[in-house]
Amino acid sequence: MAVTACQGLGFVVSLIGIAGIIAATCMDQWSTQDLYNNPVTAVFNYQGLWRSCVRESSGFTECRGYFTLLGLPAMLQAVRALMIVGIVLGAIGLLVSIFALKCIRIGSMEDSAKANMTLTSGIMFIVSGLCAIAGVSVFANMLVTNFWMSTANMYTGMGGMVQTVQTRYTFGAALFVGWVAGGLTLIGGVMMCIACRGLAPEETNYKAVSYHASGHSVAYKPGGFKASTGFGSNTKNKKIYDGGARTEDEVQSYPSKHDYV
């Protein structure tokens, strides 16, 4: 039960995280105009990974795409690449994790296969989250560097009479969305990896068989002295699979291994 919950929660958290990474990548507000030195500006500038926008106080917003590829800063290209890699890995991870979910039945898929898929998706989510966090952090670092560079030569002018205010940019909403989304994807991935441990059956060199005497139903396990007295409907011989971390009531509820997914 705890495994299913952990896996399900990991999936949901990762799903939210990847949706957030996609949203952040598409958002125009990666950097927004710093209004500290000019809070009365009627024109507001903001930039994304794909285009830059200007919102006039009339409400008129004009956005221009970066139609050049070679003319863009290498750092911006790197951020784009990291975010796209994060999205692709996250999307594949989501696809894999859907089939790995314990609550979904797909033919007669073994627990071990589900465990492997869960681990794979978990690793993908972790890498996806790290890509997003790295991408956002690289962009943030770029902003900080440019901010202080533009602060150093903020005002230029003719004899101090005319001021030319250089537009400075600060952290936009997309950065915070990206950090949070990357973090969620990372957490979701870790949860999937934890769930994988609970799904993976332990390696056993034997098949446990229960032998039932006519009177007291006693289960004898080769190589072990642990016996359990059985009462109730457990009259027919059946294989007991001891592998895997599962509770006693789970064993009773799901007696056949083919009932597991």
């Epitope: 009627a42 024109v43 930039q47 200007v54 009339s58 008129f60």
Partner: antibody, heavy 119, light 113 residues
């Protein structure tokens, strides 16, 4: 077509208050900022402030913040500017102007209300 | 506040002449985000409200004759009337559209001889 109707004139006593109106027609009133501009006789233009009819959001020239209050009545598509504690310095022509959407310049202006403050 | 300085304060020309008037701002009106200059030119004829002529320093408002041309960038702007007509008798104002409060120049009065 777009029209901004303003009363031709208002005569008020010093110390009193007045509420100037600007009735808009021919466009979606709530989509455009409404500006108010002051022009004293034989003088230049002074921007008082602006209001967005949809949100009621305002932006004032600091100089007029304690003098003017901008409001709107969406149901009648009318913008108002209340001027308080009137003095002879407030005697002027007051224009309302609609914000041009492709730029931040007003493109439609009312004919203006001539406010006379006299005892 | 941005101070707008217009010169000359008045001009007297004959019909058909070319006219140039200047407007200087105390701070740059050039927005780096879109490389547009947020300066507007208005024409105000006697007894009438101002009329928008040019916005973004050089973009003519629809319906404005092409004899009106706006130019300049940063802090120095110019309005040129290539061939003055009798109906151009008016006061011409430049306005800062970049920063609150929106400020106007004192105006250039154009008179026809």
């Amino acid at each position: 077509q777009v029209q901004l109707q303003q009363p031709g004139s208002e005569l008020v006593k010093p110390g009193a208050s007045v509420k100037l109106s600007c009735k808009a027609s021919g466009y979606t009133f709530t989509s455009y900022w409404m500006h108010w501009v002051k022009q004293r006789p034989g003088q230049g233009l002074e921007w008082i402030g602006m209001i967005h009819p949809n949100s009621g959001s305002t932006n004032y020239n600091e100089k007029f913040k304690s003098k003017a209050t901008l409001t709107v009545d969406k149901s009648s598509s009318t913008a108002y500017m209340q001027l308080s504690s009137l003095t002879s310095e407030d005697s002027a022509v007051y224009y309302c102007a609609r914000r041009y959407y492709g730029s931040i310049s007003p493109d439609y202006w009312g004919q203006g209300t001539t406010l006379t403050v006299s005892s | 506040d941005i101070v707008m300085t217009q010169s000359p304060s008045s001009l007297s020309v004959t019909a058909g002449e070319k006219v140039t008037m200047s407007c200087k701002s105390s701070q740059s009106l050039l927005n780096s985000g879109n490389q547009k200059n947020y300066l507007t030119w208005y024409q105000q004829k006697p007894g009438q409200p101002p009329k928008l002529l040019i916005y973004w320093a050089s973009t003519r408002e629809s319906g404005v004759p092409d004899r009106f041309t706006g130019s300049g960038s940063g802090t120095d702007f110019t309005l040129t009337i290539s061939s003055v007509q009798a109906e151009d008798l008016a006061v011409y104002y430049c306005q800062n559209d970049y920063s609150y409060p929106f400020t106007f120049g004192s105006g250039t009065k154009l008179e026809i001889k």
